[in-house]
C-alpha cells in the first residue's frame, strides 16, 4: 500500500510511505 495509517496494538507509530510513488519507473532521459 502507498500509505500506512493507524497504530498497532503496541502503540507503535506507522511510517508514512506517501512521499514515494507506489510503482516507480526509471526517469527517462530527455
Amino acid at each position: 500500500s502507498e500509505t500506512t495509517t493507524g497504530t498497532s496494538s503496541n502503540s507503535s507509530q506507522s511510517t508514512s510511505n506517501s512521499g514515494l510513488a507506489p510503482n516507480p519507473t526509471n526517469a527517462t532521459t530527455k
Epitope: T4, T7, S8, S12, S14, T15, N17, A21, T28
Partner: antibody, heavy 115, light 112 residues
Framework: EVKFEESGGGLVQPGGSIKLSCAAS????????MDWVRQTPEKGLEWVAE??????????YYAESVKGRFTISRDDSKSRVYLQMNNLRTEDTGIYYC??????WGQGTSVTVSS | DIVMTQTPLSLSVTIGQPASISCKSS???????????LNWLQQRPGQSPKRLIY???KLDPGIPDRFSGSGSETDFTLKISRVEAEDLGIYYC?????????FGGGTKLEIK
C-alpha cells in the same frame, strides 16, 4: 517515540566489504518501505537503495552507482534493515542514514573507504 | 536522472519575517495516479534530515503550520510564514516520482 539507529560503519579499504544495520523501534516496521541514503560534502544527499514491504513482495531498488555491489535486506521479526556493501570504492565514503521512506531518519553511521 | 535545482543557495532572514525557497525539477513530477511526489526536508546543524512536507503541500505530523508547500509539475516552493530561531539549517527538496530518488543541493537558512 520513533527511533532508527544505524550501526556497522567504520574504516574499510578499497575493494573491501562492510555491513550496515539499522534497528527500528516505536514504528510498525513491517509496513515501512526502508531506504538507505548517504551524505557527502561533495554530492550532498544521495539515495542508495530501498526495500519495500511484504505486501509489495519486498521489491528492491538501487542507485546505478551501487548496483551489483550493494544489497539491501530486512528482517521484520527483528525490525532491522541491512545494507551489505561489497567491492567498496573511495567514492562510497560518507554518512549513511536509514530512513522509513524519507519519513523518519536515523542519526547516521560513517563509512570511510581509504587505503 | 531527475535534476532538482534549488534557489537560493542561502538566505539570511530576520526572526518573524517570511522566507521562501524554490525548487525546480528537470521533468514533471506528476505521477500517473494524479499525485505529485515532491518532499521537503530540513536538516538542522549536526542533525539528520527530517521530512517536513510530502506530496507538495501535506505537512508531516508535528510540523508547525508556519511551513507550507506549493507548486505543481516542475516548479515548487517552500514557504515559512514567520521564521523562528529553530528553523536555521539546510532545506532540501526531494522527488519520489521517478527512480532514482533525487535531492536538491540544499538551501541554507541563516538567522540575521
Amino acid at each position: 517515540e520513533v527511533k532508527f539507529e544505524e550501526s556497522g560503519g567504520g574504516l574499510v579499504q578499497p575493494g573491501g566489504s562492510i555491513k550496515l544495520s539499522c534497528a527500528a523501534s516505536g514504528v510498525t516496521f513491517s509496513e515501512a518501505w526502508m531506504d538507505w541514503v548517504r551524505q557527502t560534502p561533495e554530492k550532498g544527499l544521495e539515495w542508495v537503495a530501498e526495500i519495500r514491504d511484504r505486501e509489495t513482495k519486498y521489491v528492491t531498488y538501487y542507485a546505478e552507482s551501487v548496483k551489483g555491489r550493494f544489497t539491501i535486506s530486512r528482517d521484520d521479526s527483528k525490525s532491522r534493515v541491512y545494507l551489505q556493501m561489497n567491492n567498496l570504492r573511495t567514492e562510497d565514503t560518507g554518512i549513511y542514514y536509514c530512513t522509513g521512506a524519507m519519513d523518519y531518519w536515523g542519526q547516521g553511521t560513517s563509512v570511510t573507504v581509504s587505503s | 536522472d531527475i535534476v532538482m535545482t534549488q534557489t537560493p543557495l542561502s538566505l539570511s532572514v530576520t526572526i518573524g519575517q517570511p522566507a521562501s525557497i524554490s525548487c525546480k525539477s528537470s521533468q514533471s513530477l506528476l505521477y500517473s495516479n494524479g499525485k505529485t511526489y515532491l518532499n521537503w526536508l530540513q536538516q538542522r546543524p549536526g542533525q539528520s534530515p527530517k521530512r517536513l512536507i510530502y506530496q507538495v503541500s501535506k505537512l508531516d505530523p508535528g510540523i508547525p503550520d508556519r511551513f507550507s508547500g506549493s507548486g505543481s509539475e516542475t516548479d515548487f516552493t517552500l514557504k515559512i510564514s514567520r521564521v523562528e530561531a529553530e528553523d536555521l539549517g539546510i532545506y532540501y527538496c526531494m522527488q519520489g516520482t521517478y527512480l532514482p530518488w533525487t535531492f536538491g543541493g540544499g538551501t541554507k537558512l541563516e538567522i540575521k
